[in-house]
């Protein structure tokens, strides 16, 4: 099988740029989703965000986030998600396990799922950026 070593030194500043881009795109997605009136956030859905037992940027649950956003893309044709997925793939290791998402079938519940996950994704990217910048500050002190 394919075991060639890959030499790749990625400065933390570059990772930060990816997360900044994701943060900006998450706000665009949320703004788009919030245009749908009369939809309430649900307590039934939780987007995995940061793992406490890993260092930034590997503490971001990128594979799971990708799976949730891919589900939204299938439920509602939001083209910004394509770009979000491309940037998440910069953080996802090529052998990361797949995440299965149970998709709501009811139309209104689908809308609640989309709003809830979009909101959590936006909050998650804010947290991820904070964890990156605080990690960088700790590394320099």
């Amino acid at each position: 099988s394919h075991t060639l070593p890959v030499r790749l030194l990625r400065p933390s500043d570059d990772v930060q740029k990816i997360v900044e881009e994701l943060q900006s795109l998450s706000k665009m997605l949320l703004k788009d989703v919030e245009e749908e009136k009369g939809v309430l956030v649900s307590q039934n859905y939780t987007l995995p965000c940061l793992s406490p037992d890993a260092q930034p940027p590997n503490n971001i649950h990128s594979p799971a986030i990708r799976a949730y956003l891919k589900t939204i893309r299938q439920l509602d044709n939001k083209s910004v998600i394509d770009e979000i997925i491309e940037h998440l793939d910069k953080l996802i290791f090529q052998d990361a396990p797949e995440t299965n998402i149970s998709v709501p079938t009811d139309t209104h519940e689908c809308k609640r799922f989309i709003l809830t996950i979009s909101q959590q994704f936006s909050e998650c990217m804010d947290l991820a950026l904070k964890s990156l910048t605080s990690g960088a500050q700790q590394a320099t002190t």
């Epitope: 099988s1 990816i18 997925i85 793939d89 910069k90």
Partner: antibody, heavy 122, light 107 residues
Framework: QVQLVQSGAEVKKPGSSVKVSCKAS????????MQWVRQAPGQGLEWMGA????????RYSQKFKGRVTITADKSTSTAYMELSSLRSEDTAVYYC???????????????WGQGTTVTVSS | AIQMTQSPSSLSASVGDRVTITCRAS??????LAWYQQKPGKVPKLLIY???TSASGVPSRFSGSRSGTDYTLTISSLQPEDVATYYC?????????FGGGTKVEIK
């Protein structure tokens, strides 16, 4: 070692379609983007599109949107690029390319197919 | 789409010369850039990825660097076997466009 083997040369009539295959072997990764690139005689490299075979997710160049379809068969590790409504300007060598690297997103395309020459002529 | 402007389109230099080729991105691509070498009638070969990391088996005379949105491929001492066309390609977001290419010849 990753190997990409493409289908053989094709001669097509204007208005018809062509489907080029690219069979990959020698890798274990599941998360990756494979790209398709073409090169007209004496011209530069032109990006056509990409596929994420694990999910069949695709991205296309605006120039080819509506005319190109990229698919993948996970069971045979084969990607396909179909170009429709062919015209003489589509005469080119078509390449598939595959990345190395620790992440799902590519940094560069380390492995290339041998190229498939497509000639469009009446 | 992000545009990649490559210069010069062609150059002629003597064996042993230092050669530089530049690609300018129309927006910040944060090192997501690769350089390829293509010899006449051959398949493109990856030289540099992630702006400055050498691909396996690439001679040390090839190197990549970055200044802002300008990315440079340098051949420190041109060899006869380096006669080829060189292309850059970005991977920041699709479409992953290529530069127009630089044809390198020996004087």
């Amino acid at each position: 070692q990753v190997q990409l083997v493409q289908s053989g040369a094709e001669v097509k009539k204007p208005g018809s379609s062509v489907k080029v295959s690219c069979k990959a072997s020698g890798y274990t990764r599941t998360r990756y983007w494979m790209q398709w690139v073409r090169q007209a005689p004496g011209q530069g490299l032109e990006w056509m599109g990409a596929i994420y075979p694990a999910e069949g997710d695709t991205r296309y160049s605006q120039k080819f949107k509506g005319r190109v379809t990229i698919t993948a068969d996970k069971s045979t590790s084969t990607a396909y690029m179909e170009l429709s409504s062919l015209r003489s300007e589509d005469t080119a060598v078509y390449y598939c390319a595959f990345p190395e690297g620790p992440y799902a997103a590519p940094y560069g395309m380390h492995y290339w197919g041998q190229g498939t020459t497509v000639t469009v002529s009446s | 789409a992000i545009q990649m402007t490559q210069s010069p389109s062609s150059l002629s230099a003597s064996v042993g010369d230092r050669v530089t080729i530049t690609c300018r991105a129309s927006r910040n691509i944060h090192n997501y850039l690769a350089w390829y070498q293509q010899k006449p009638g051959k398949v493109p070969k990856l030289l540099i990825y992630y702006a400055k990391t050498s691909a396996s088996g690439v001679p040390s005379r090839f190197s990549g660097s970055r200044s802002g949105t300008d990315y440079t491929l340098t051949i420190s001492s041109l060899q006869p076997e380096d006669v080829a066309t060189y292309y850059c390609q970005h991977f920041w977001k699709t479409p992953w466009t290529f530069g127009g290419g630089t044809k390198v010849e020996i004087k």
